[in-house]
Amino acid sequence: NFMYSKTVKRLSKLQEYQQYYPSLTCVMEGKDMEDWSCCPTPWTSFQSSCYFISTVMQSWTKSQNNCSVMGADLVVINTKEEQDFITQNLKINSAYFLGLSDPKGWRHWQWVDQTPYNKNVTFWHSGEPNSPDERCAIINFRSEEWGWNDVHCHVPQKSICKMKKIYI
């Protein structure tokens, strides 16, 4: 009876999400393997988040709007482990917008989701950021490593979206 009601709840939750995400990929987790955590297909998952790499070249603002339509934001990177996971799926000759910007050019960097900007957990390439006119951040591969660079916001780039996992 308990299992039956849990399944019914899950099905109604799935139907609810179906209008936004035609397909979800779910895995069982939790100590009793009773919880399902899901990401839209073909997003990838790491810890409690889902990630989508957009190969559409767009400005930073348009990229963020595009993520927003999918219920996500441009990616906020909180740890080196998270960055290492993300970069496994990136092309080394491309650049991808992050959810990090400095709209006034005052070197007051801010994350799109209002996560506090912690200078101690940043992965700027050497010498970056280097221009107050370059107010948006990308991640790219340079000098044998992945790192961040400040670029012009209006210049189209690929991008990475991030959203919280869906729990059903």
Partner: antibody, heavy 121, light 111 residues
């Protein structure tokens, strides 16, 4: 006083080349992104190219990509536009303009008086 | 690219009258509180002159009779009382994404 003075325009045959120059004064030239914008007779203004302050980025619309090259010489306070394989549709007044970044975009706060380019056989 | 449509194409008014010029973008040129539309004035044989940046900010040295408003796709330039020197062509411009684009212009002429 900020001044931008263009030169180098003229009459050229289709397929020919021209090099436009823009002499800047009255401001720290190396600190600003610069653009070329053109205006064909009776048409709207059209952006032609941009070069960043540090010379690290150049941008072009598809209509001129591969034919036009923007460059700058910060020591001479000068901006250039090398135009090759010119077409009749490149006929226009060419303005150089200074860029000011504003939030996620930019605007042009000072413009030169323009130099006329006519492409005709 | 973002297409900017200005209306009317021509505005015939007398000195002292109020002028209201419209610029409509094919998609939003706003992001949160940033409205990335700018306005220029151009007189025959002259270079464009910046009037308003960021939809509503008056450029230094521009008379206070000029004002701008709007967000997303709809923007307005208002001249509260036309002076003889205000009869010219007015352009809007966006640069939220490359390529930066301009409107076709509104000509304000003496009635």
């Amino acid at each position: 006083e900020v001044q931008l003075v263009e030169s180098g325009g003229g009459l050229v045959k289709p397929g020919g080349s021209l090099r436009l120059s823009c002499a800047a004064s009255g401001f720290t030239f190396r600190s600003y992104g610069m653009s070329w914008v053109r205006q064909a007779p009776g048409k709207r203004l059209e952006w032609v190219s941009t070069i960043s302050s540090g010379d690290s980025y150049t941008y072009y619309p598809d209509s001129v990509k591969g034919r036009f090259t923007i460059s700058r010489d910060n020591a001479k306070n000068s901006l250039y536009l090398q135009m090759n394989s010119l077409r009749a549709e490149d006929t226009a007044v060419y303005y150089c303009a200074r860029q000011i970044y504003y939030d996620y975009a930019y605007y042009f706060d000072f413009w030169g008086q323009g130099t006329t380019v006519t492409v005709s056989s | 690219e973002i297409v900017l449509t200005q209306s009317p194409a021509t505005l015939s008014l007398s000195p002292g009258e109020r002028a209201t010029l419209s610029c409509r973008a094919s998609e939003s040129v706003s992001f949160r509180t940033s409205h990335l539309m700018h306005w220029y004035q151009q007189k025959p044989g002259q270079a464009p002159r910046l009037l308003i940046y960021g939809a509503s900010n008056l450029e230094s040295g521009i008379p206070a009779r000029f004002s701008g408003s709007g967000s997303e796709t709809d923007f307005t330039l208002t001249i509260s009382r036309l002076e003889p020197e205000d009869f010219a062509v007015y352009f809007c411009q966006q640069s939220i994404e490359d390529p930066p684009t301009f409107g076709g212009g509104t000509k304000v002429e003496i009635k």
